[in-house]
Amino acid sequence: SIPWNLERITPPRYRADEYQPPDGGSLVEVYLLDTSIQSDHREIEGRVMVTDFENVPEEDGTRFHRQASKCDSHGTHLAGVVSGRDAGVAKGASMRSLRVLNCQGKGTVSGTLIGLEFIRKSQLVQPVGPLVVLLPLAGGYSRVLNAACQRLARAGVVLVTAAGNFRDDACLYSPASAPEVITVGATNAQDQPVTLGTLGTNFGRCVDLFAPGEDIIGASSDCSTCFVSQSGTSQAAAHVAGIAAMMLSAEPELTLAELRQRLIHFSAKDVINEAWFPEDQRVLTPNLVAALPPSTHENLYFQ
Amino acid sequence: GAMGQEDEDGDYEELVLALRSEEDGLAEAPEHGTTATFHRCAKDPWRLPGTYVVVLKEETHLSQSERTARRLQAQAARRGYLTKILHVFHGLLPGFLVKMSGDLLELALKLPHVDYIEEDSSVFAQ
């Protein structure tokens, strides 16, 4: 049986007992700015190239033990959600990882900026097909981080980011508040906004759309064949990065505006229970859950 | 995300440091009437004081960025402050990343080509 999240983003006409998840995104490179990853995990081996980029702060606390599987946990899971063989969205997409988050999942605005600059320089040195940049991280509103995202977007790169897990207005966070970035909130199997402890998904007019972000099965760094369930707006953003990769692979000439329009067009409308959001934010928050197109050129999305 | 909105600062703090009239030995003064601004994260625990991104005006070349960074170091040294240039940006935004005392912000804001300065802050896996 298909994991609920893959079923949710798949158009009904492709659902069947013998469902083979879509195998697309092969013309697209997805950059992941996150923790280190276990690149030879069975789900993602050969699909993720670990770049030599690393810019992370030291871990907090004198008694912190650097355990490899924990250091790799967040990034490995997200790489699996984007392009994993069995539980991934865009099974044909190749990925490149940059380490901007330390073993505690913490990074800096400056490290992220240098990472974005690295991507731009790589793009200039060796132009490839369409690029998607996944930023599964958030900090406070940052003029400079938003400006860097804007510049990269204007260079033709599609940026997808997590709305944030603070149960707050996404406009107060970066890169979620950057207008050129596709900002993704998280919903669950009941199409409810995701609650995470006392907090939950961010909301508001800086969110572009929502995607599955609760109990998402993906590669676990605990072992080379392990899977684990994780939740958050990072997982939601990874779904949209995968969908974007598939759309761009099918139509490589799409502009950012056209891609955004398609993402919105193919989303499920008005399925989210808005009562979860603060009253003043309900009208501002898009009631959209991301989905793949029920493609007329089927072979492009479902090879 | 969500195109079409204007940049909203929210709780974001913008501290405009007025430029003093004296030129402080600069070869080029900032353009008349422009005031470089200082920004920092509104969420105090996420702030990383002591590291700053100095963002220069859009058309600034790499050589000018490097010169501006060196000028800041020289002027800071004259005041007895150690500074360290951690990275010079080019390709996306012109500017540089500097480790320095917050006491030097007023001086840094007066440098030629400076558009704004942002204190570094934390980001987190979501």
Epitope: Q38, E45, A68, R85, K91, T225 | -
Partner: antibody, heavy 115, light 109 residues
């Protein structure tokens, strides 16, 4: 191009150990693990286990647990498979292959166990 | 881990099509999209012909195709040629390991 080159044939006595090497080239060594597969004369392929070139973690087939050790040396992009307490039925060709995907194979190393 | 079930031998004439089946369980073939097919000529290392059920690596003839239904995967070779005579093995992920089929000897008559 991507290549896996294995060490030469070995003849061992029952009870001894054998260590086969597999040198990788033409790709980023740590992006894939190494699988080890053996084939007894006239028999089919048998998966023995996998070793991570990224962090050294291993995943052994239950049948070989306790008798096999798989390791990697990232400085030389080489993987090793050591099989202990050899028996005559361990006589086989031992192959290394790239990752779980096993898309590229070594040429094979013949190990003969005979008294 | 018991091997996946393949027919011991299959015969075909040049130009014909043949299909080799590979039957597993809901814990291996049925559960994963990672079924591969390997061709092995005598005295040679195996060569991957199909991966992830139906994908062909570059350089492999489009006469080779793969599919899966439930717990059974299939390899089809169309327009059979003399050089296709070889042993063919399927493999699949299991929850923790890998498992091969027992192998099928293809004879081109």
């Amino acid at each position: 191009q991507v290549q896996l080159v294995q060490s030469g044939a070995e003849v061992k006595k029952p009870g001894a150990s054998v260590k086969v090497s597999c040198k990788a080239s033409g790709y980023s060594f740590t992006s894939y693990g190494i699988s080890w597969v053996r084939q007894a004369p006239g028999q089919g392929l048998e998966w023995m286990g996998w070793v991570s070139a990224y962090n050294g973690n291993t995943n052994y087939a239950q049948k070989f647990q306790g008798r096999v050790t798989m390791t990697t040396d990232t400085s030389t992009s080489t993987a090793y498979m050591e099989l202990r307490s050899l028996r005559s039925d361990d006589t086989a060709v031992y192959y290394c292959a790239r990752g779980y995907v096993m898309d590229v194979w070594g040429q094979g190393t013949t190990v003969t166990v005979s008294s | 881990q018991s091997a996946l079930t393949q027919p011991a031998s299959v015969f075909g004439s040049p130009g014909q099509s043949i299909t080799i089946s590979c039957t597993g369980t809901s814990s291996d073939v049925g559960a994963y999209n990672s079924v591969s097919w390997y061709q092995q000529h005598p005295g040679k290392a195996p060569k991957r012909m199909i991966y992830e059920v139906s994908n062909r690596p570059s350089g492999v003839s489009n006469r080779f195709s793969g599919s899966k239904s439930g717990n059974t995967a299939s390899l089809t070779i169309s327009g059979l040629q003399a050089e296709d005579e070889a042993d063919y093995y399927c493999s699949s992920y299991t929850s923790t390991n890998m498992v091969f089929g027992g192998g099928t000897k293809l004879t081109v008559l």
